[in-house]
């Protein structure tokens, strides 16, 4: 099995430095009344995405169709990467997440140019859509740093609903209580390799 998790906090720790450097920009943006989510991402990060059980998330995209696989990767295969773009959430949150001054970190996830993961809350599905910026709210997920160097992705559009794994596919999973936040099927590992 692949063990990615030891790479994760190398990046997450570095975010604190980025926050410090960005505070002036956020402050100025607030004074000028500019939308904070309208500015550029705080940072961008290419990472492979795997489940708590070390299965890889891979993306098979064509112009008119796509498939997202959750699978054990072959030994000689390179892992797919997603481009995670980090934003500061507009709304303060009481929940425990990575953030500055009580604000949450949000991310968008892109497996290739012009495509982003979207939450389809009606169908409880995770979809890939081609779209232009500014991205719709369905493309934003609140990032939570969990135990064992794992992260989880909570829908901006539907708090309490997370990207998770169901029947070897990505799906949206409703989490009823804070104890269930540690349920394995919504935990993911990020790796730079």
């Amino acid at each position: 099995m692949h063990h990615h998790h030891h790479h994760h906090h190398h990046h997450a720790a570095g975010l604190n430095d980025i926050f410090e450097a960005q505070k002036i920009e956020w402050h100025e943006a607030a004074i000028e009344g500019r939308s904070i989510t309208g500015i550029s991402p705080i940072t961008e990060y290419l990472a492979s995405l795997s489940t708590y059980n070390d299965q890889s998330i891979t993306f098979a995209l064509e112009d008119e169709s796509y498939e997202i696989y959750v699978e054990d990767l072959k030994k000689d295969e390179k892992k797919d990467k997603v481009l995670l773009s980090y934003y500061e959430s507009q709304h303060p949150s009481n929940e425990s997440g990575d953030g500055v001054d009580g604000k949450m970190l949000m991310v968008t996830l892109s497996p290739t140019k012009d495509f982003w993961l979207h939450a389809n809350n009606k169908e409880h599905s995770v979809e890939l859509h081609k779209c232009e910026k500014p991205l719709p709210d369905q493309a934003f997920f609140v990032l939570h740093n969990m135990h064992s160097n794992c992260v989880s992705f909570e829908c901006k559009t539907d708090p309490g609903v997370f990207i998770g794994v169901k029947d070897n596919h990505l799906a949206l999973i409703k989490v009823d209580s804070s104890e269930n936040l540690c349920t394995e099927n919504i935990l993911f590992k990020l790796s730079e390799t």
Partner: antibody, heavy 126, light 106 residues
Framework: EVQLLESGGGLVQPGGSLRLSCAAS????????MSWVRQAPGKGLEWVSG????????YYADSVKGRFTISRDNSKNTLYLQMNSLRAEDTAVYYC???????????????????WGQGTMVTVSS | SYVLTQPPSVSVSPGQTASITCSGE??????AAWYQQKPGQSPVLVIY???KRPSGIPERFSGSNSGNTATLTISGTQAMDEADYYC?????????FGGGTKVTVL
């Protein structure tokens, strides 16, 4: 509908040059890695060269390295193969092939060839 | 360089099963693809990622891959399946094809 149309083949003397083109339509050309694959008369398929979509990295078979150059023009939806110092053993039908899936950020040539052109014949002979 | 070995020819009666092998070092650690090529035509992808069929490819085509051998199986072979078949893998950002197998339907 995905279409790949090769052109530029013909008869050329040993040591000569040719430039093949592959006009692509029916898909977002700039999102897919592309390759050239050849087939000598009565022989099997041989991968020749490939080019990434994201950073335009190029890859070559040892048999053509230093003589052939692959390139692409995303604004024209066209793939090219510049062939120099041609030899008799380069005689083949040259196919343009598109990867099955859009290239992931990780890059490189990783996917099977989902679509093929009809091929263009290159004959190297004196 | 990486080498994939296929039998030059396989003969099968209509309705019977044809199996084409493709051998390479640690083949099972890579994803295998299979292409069908009929005389005078361009190749067509029939199996990718070892076992998956593109849309439009009949269910009688199936694939497997483990150890040092990938196998393409044609169940209930039909006359129209007579063609050359090539296996292929990606190795260090290059495409590697097997030598091809001519399937003859008797």
């Amino acid at each position: 509908e995905v279409q790949l149309l090769e052109s530029g083949g013909g008869l050329v003397q040993p040591g000569g040059s040719l430039r093949l083109s592959c006009a692509a339509s029916g898909f977002t050309f700039s999102s897919y890695a592309m390759s050239w694959v050849r087939q000598a008369p009565g022989k099997g398929l041989e991968w020749v060269s490939g080019i990434s979509a994201i950073d335009q990295s190029t890859y070559y078979a040892d048999s053509v390295k230093g003589r052939f150059t692959i390139s692409r023009d995303n604004s024209k939806n066209t793939l090219y193969l510049q062939m120099n110092s041609l030899r008799a053993e380069d005689t083949a039908v040259y196919y343009c092939a598109r990867d099955l899936w859009m290239e992931n950020w990780v890059g490189g040539l990783r996917y099977p060839f989902g679509y093929w052109g009809q091929g263009t014949m290159v004959t190297v002979s004196s | 360089s990486y080498v994939l070995t296929q039998p030059p020819s396989v003969s099968v009666s209509p309705g019977q099963t044809a199996s084409i092998t493709c051998s390479g070092e640690r083949m099972g650690d890579k994803y295998a693809a299979w292409y069908q090529q009929k005389p005078g035509q361009s190749p067509v992808l029939v199996i990718y990622r070892d076992t998956k069929r593109p849309s439009g490819i009949p269910e009688r085509f199936s694939g497997s891959n483990s150890g040092n051998t990938a196998t393409l199986t044609i169940s209930g072979t039909q006359a129209m399946d007579e063609a050359d078949y090539y296996c292929e893998v990606k190795k260090s950002d290059t495409g590697v094809f097997g030598g091809g197998t001519k399937v003859t339907v008797l």
